[in-house]
């Protein structure tokens, strides 16, 4: 057991197995479930995280009105197919040969079909609206302090460039964080807004994905910001294709 082995961990993803067996004895970490090598300097893709989660033992007014095309993840957990880069494959199927198309954050964007269903491309989610309700506090948070703290959080904890945090809206007790990132804006090395939103969602639920770190301790000017409800809306570059039956349900 060497010092190198002690150092060989994945700070950004605890759902990994690491060993110093990479090129030249360098540390290499692989995601549970998929066995894919992950870059531990940044966030792991949501697809690989979902796959790892499914493989793990089961234990446990200024406000924005989401557009008519906004998607909410109502389907919950599934074991996804990821491409060699760790992104969601455009078509996902379950063990009973039921298939559907997903967007870049893995949320279903079509009706379910059979194996003949075609999903021509992975449609990018370019706008994410995170809708939070905070627990009652003595008074409202200062909007600019709240804005600065959330931008700092997304930069420092989730490695997301501040330019992708489009806006922070606040009408006590509702906070809305808008993340925007078009395909053309995302450079190599940039964290994907979908991955940042997923890490944030898990943090809020008290299920941090970071290695050995304490949970999320959000404070605005020293005052704890405790979230009691979260809703996340996803807007795709191409609107989803659902039948009228679903839309009128």
């Amino acid at each position: 057991h060497t010092a190198a082995q002690d150092n060989c961990t994945c700070p950004t993803n605890k759902m990994t197995v690491c060993s110093p067996d990479g090129p030249g004895g360098r540390c290499q970490c692989r995601a549970l479930g998929s066995g894919m090598a992950v870059d531990c300097s940044t966030l792991t893709s949501k697809c690989l995280l979902l796959k790892a989660r499914m493989s793990a033992p089961k234990n446990a007014r200024t406000l924005v009105r989401p557009s008519e095309h906004a998607l909410v993840d109502n389907d919950g957990l599934y074991d996804p197919d990821c491409d060699p880069e760790g992104r969601f494959k455009a078509r996902q199927c379950n063990q009973t040969s039921v298939c559907w198309c997903v967007n870049s954050v893995g949320v279903r964007r079509t009706d379910k079909g059979d194996l003949s269903l075609r999903c021509d491309e992975l449609v990018r989610t370019h706008h994410i609206l995170i809708d939070l309700r905070h627990r009652p506090t003595a008074g409202a948070f200062n909007h600019s302090d709240l804005d600065a703290e959330l931008r700092r959080l997304f930069r420092e904890r989730y490695r997301l460039h501040p330019k992708f945090v489009a806006a922070v809206h606040y009408e006590q007790p509702t906070i809305q964080i808008e993340l925007r990132q078009n395909t053309s804006q995302k450079a190599a090395g940039d964290v994907d807004i979908g991955d940042a939103a997923y890490y944030f969602e898990r943090d809020i639920k008290g299920e941090s994905l970071f290695q050995g770190r304490g949970g999320l301790d959000l404070r605005v000017r020293g005052e704890p910001l405790q979230v009691e409800r979260t809703l996340i809306y996803y807007l795709d570059e191409i609107p989803p294709k659902f039948s009228m039956k679903r839309l009128t349900a």
Epitope: C8, C10, C18, G25, D39, R155, P162, A187
Partner: antibody, heavy 122, light 109 residues
Framework: QQLEESGGGLVKPEGSLTLTCKGS????????WMWWVRQAPGKGLEWIA?????????TYYASWAKGRFTISSTSSTAVTLQATSLTAADTATYFC???????????????WGPGTLVTVSS | FEMTQTPSSVSEPVGGTVTIKCQAS??????LGWYQQKPGQPPKLLIY???TLASGVPSRFKGSGSGTEFTLTISDLECADAATYYC????????????FGGGTEVVVK
């Protein structure tokens, strides 16, 4: 714990060279970033590139360094910087430094090598 | 993104106090380091996280500030403090910009 750079010296204009940074007393397999910084004679510090030496090998480059400089880490004990198409403006002392955290955006340099002088002249 | 350091040079007597300012063109929270460099030597980390003293650095060195405005104060100046001081951040490293300030030469009379 210390760092040491090697590979500096006199290079002709349009020439190329490879600088190596070796660590002793610690292993490069940790969860941190290694950086190259340079300093022209009598001038300030200028960041060139950095590489994550844990699992992943992510890199970042200064805008002006992209395409001409390449940072790499092929072993758990060394980081290299390759430079091409050198000009007199690249004459400087080149330092390697170890970042203190896993997060590239919250990094400061707690260990530096003594530097190696690169002179570009015909 | 740019780090602007002022002044470029300052001269104070032994026992005096020097104040160096560093301004970031955008909010960098508390992600700022201060370094001391003497001729022929690599820089030495003095302060990180805007105000935390690095190991072995005397308490005469004090860092403060957050957001865009930062200050390094050296009190009870000693001859050994004669050096060039740099501020540094990596907050916007993905923009490919130099995170170092231009440097401040401190002369101790």
């Amino acid at each position: 714990q210390q760092l040491e750079e090697s590979g500096g010296g006199l290079v002709k204009p349009e020439g190329s060279l490879t600088l190596t940074c070796k660590g002793s007393g610690f292993d490069f397999s940790g969860t941190y970033w290694m950086w190259w910084v340079r300093q022209a004679p009598g001038k300030g510090l200028e960041w060139i590139a950095c590489i994550y030496v844990g699992s992943g090998s992510s890199t970042y480059y200064a805008s002006w360094a992209k395409g001409r400089f390449t940072i790499s880490s092929t072993s758990s004990t060394a980081v290299t910087l390759q430079a091409t198409s050198l000009t007199a403006a690249d004459t400087a002392t080149y330092f390697c430094a170890r970042g203190a955290t896993n997060n590239v955006f919250m990094n400061y340099f707690n260990l530096w090598g003594p530097g190696t002088l690169v002179t570009v002249s015909s | 993104f740019e780090m602007t350091q002022t002044p470029s040079s300052v001269s104070e007597p032994v026992g005096g106090t020097v104040t160096i300012k560093c301004q970031a063109s955008e909010d960098i929270s508390s992600n700022l380091g201060w370094y001391q460099q003497k001729p022929g030597q690599p820089p030495k980390l003095l302060i990180y996280g805007a105000s935390t003293l690095a190991s072995g650095v005397p308490s005469r060195f004090k860092g403060s500030g957050s957001g865009t405005e930062f200050t390094l104060t050296i009190s009870d100046l000693e001859c050994a403090d004669a050096a060039t001081y740099y501020c540094q951040t990596s907050y916007y490293i993905d923009d490919g910009v130099n995170g170092f300030g231009g440097g401040t030469e401190v002369v101790v009379k």
